[in-house]
Interface confidence: low
């Protein structure tokens, strides 16, 4: 056959779907690899073809599109199950061809089981919300275009295994969720569960995403450099190892980026001449704040070294800071034979 | 509330059919389980149908007990069993922390 | 799978006295864990849910704690009427799993 543009196996888009649901999957050429959409295809004369690899087999085969109750049927870029057998899982293809034109690209689909209580292997998308910040809202995700705007879908929300009712803060609002007050507390697993009609059937939708409570920006601070401090002063012998800490803390802050790094006289420590390492640790609070330690490290100090500027700086969205470290050299405690004898007058 | 009824002598691989009759809330807004136990030992957890109909078993309990329900009950259907099944069989709304037990209902398997 | 070990599995304790019961998970049950207390010809009562949380109407005498694998019951001050067999029961999964509950613990009141 002619050649035929091929994007490989796409495992960027690792497709997870529940056993026993519907599934509706979009061909990826049109999404990421081409420049055009799946209408502007079919008008060009260009067939979408598809065919799956099983599981643990190398043979590609055809769909079979004539199974009972159309349970796999494609309409347009999108190739449905209604709904999903365990055996689904495979390696997908969807290949956009003409006499003269072949485009495919390959993705796997897994369908995972879920247990009563909503565990399974899926990988959980992540909502942040703030603390105590008034009331926000998570929505059930990813049930766009399984059913028309006509059918009026009963949703059901659980937090774990529990369906969420009467819960003091936390109120089931159709596709939203609503968190009065968002709270520790409210830290875990969230699912919602879309029950629709369609042809006489009922189908399940089950989504699940993870909610972490995280620091709100209205208590967001500046970094606050905890360590070097005004009240430490390192004081070392030439030939000791000199270790300060640079220990800064973080206020939550969506989407930004924190940084610490050092400075000796005024440089970055790589782009000067002494055996310096650094070792960076991050630990995080139940809120995300996070606390960033730099350990400046020079096994054997010189005097020289010991008279150099050493500046830890940090920085956020919510501003920059710097702080000096105080390092001086130590002066040796008197021989009293030899500099006491000299004070004395003897020769 | 929820009471259980439908327990009695029984033998060896017969069948029966236990019920759990809900008043005062809705099945479709709640997980059930059915928990038994023998005489003079502990809890042991059967199995439990969610709100939407699913229903989930204990390993050793998959394929010898059927958990199924309606508007208003909740069934355990027990095939073949056996002498070890000798026990007291309770219904209990909700599985994360069940907040709602029926008294149970004495299944007796002898021959 | 989810495995439940009580222990002890019985214990003698003095009027005014504490208790500790512990429930250990072979795997961990982000805090899908429930106590029960029950007294003989009696279906279990629910004491705490979600590891910590006390159920409506129940002593703040009885205390849950724990987190992963490792859960504990608590009873301060422990009363005539605490005498009872006392189980957890892991919500997390109820799936494919041996027992749900803990073997139980007897709390003998001198």
């Known amino acids: 056959s002619e050649r035929c543009d091929d994007w490989g196996l796409d495992t960027m888009r690792q497709i997870q779907v529940f056993e026993d649901e519907p599934a509706r999957i979009k061909c990826p050429l049109f999404e990421h690899f081409l420049k055009f959409n799946y209408s502007t295809a079919h008008s060009a004369g260009l067939t979408l073809i598809w065919y799956w690899t099983r599981q643990d087999r190398d043979l590609e085969e055809p769909i079979n599109f004539r199974l009972p109750e159309n349970r796999i049927s494609k309409e347009k870029d999108v190739l449905w199950f209604r709904p999903t057998l365990l055996n689904d899982t495979g390696n997908y293809t969807c290949m956009l061809r003409n006499t003269t034109y072949c485009s495919k690209v390959a993705f796997p689909l897994e369908v995972v089981q879920k247990d009563s209580c909503f565990n399974s292997p899926m990988k959980l998308p992540v909502h942040k919300l703030y603390i105590e910040y008034g009331i926000q809202r998570i929505t059930c995700p990813n049930v766009d275009g399984y059913f028309p705007s006509s059918v009026k879908p009963t949703i059901t929300w659980y937090m774990g295994c529990y369906k969420i009712q009467n819960f003091n803060n936390v109120i089931p609002e159709g596709m939203n969720l609503s968190f009065l007050i968002a709270l520790i507390s409210n830290n875990g697993n969230y699912t919602c569960v879309v029950t629709y009609p369609e042809n006489g059937r009922t189908f399940h939708l089950t989504r699940t995403l993870t909610v972490k409570v995280v620091g709100s920006p209205k208590n967001a601070v500046p970094p606050v450099i905890h360590s070097p401090n005004d009240h430490v002063v390192y004081e070392k012998e030439p030939g000791e190892e000199l270790l300060i800490p640079c220990t800064v803390y973080f206020s939550f802050l969506m989407d930004s980026r924190n940084e610490v790094w050092w400075t000796i006289d005024g440089k970055k420590p790589d782009d000067i001449t002494i055996d310096v390492t650094i070792n960076e640790s991050i630990s995080h609070s139940r809120t995300e704040d996070e606390t960033r330690t730099q350990i400046l490290s020079i096994k054997k100090v010189t005097s020289e070294d010991l008279k150099r500027s050493y500046v830890c700086h940090a920085r956020s969205a919510k501003g920059e800071v710097a702080k000096a470290a105080k390092v001086k050299q130590k002066v040796p405690a008197p021989r009293y034979t030899v500099e006491l004898a000299c004070g004395f007058g003897a020769t | 509330s929820l009471e259980e009824s439908g327990g009695r002598l029984i033998t060896p691989g017969g069948s029966l059919t236990l019920t759990c009759t809900v008043s005062g809330f809705s099945l479709s807004s709640y997980h059930m389980q059915w928990v038994r136990q023998a005489p003079g030992k502990g809890l042991e957890y059967i199995g439990y149908?969610?709100?939407?109909?699913g229903s989930y078993y204990a390993s050793w309990a998959k394929g010898r007990f059927t958990i199924s329900k309606t508007s208003t009950t909740v069934d355990l259907k027990i095939t073949s069993p056996t002498t070890a099944d000798t026990a007291t069989y309770f219904c209990a709304r909700d599985f994360a922390g069940s907040d709602l037990w029926g008294q149970g209902t004495l299944v007796t398997v002898a021959s | 799978a989810y495995d439940m070990t009580q222990t002890p599995a019985s214990v003698e304790v003095a009027v005014g006295g504490t208790v500790t019961i512990k429930c250990q998970a072979s795997q961990s049950i982000d805090y899908y864990l429930a106590w029960y207390q029950q007294k003989p010809g009696q279906p279990p009562k629910l004491l705490i849910y979600r590891a910590s949380t006390l159920a409506s109407g129940v002593s703040s005498r009885f205390k849950g704690s724990g987190s992963g694998t490792d859960y504990t019951l608590t009873i301060s001050g422990v009363e005539s009427a605490d005498a009872a067999t006392y189980y957890c029961q892991q919500g997390y999964s109820g799936n494919n799993v041996d027992n749900t509950f803990g073997g139980g613990t007897e709390v003998v009141v001198k």
């Open positions: 149908i969610n709100s939407l109909g």
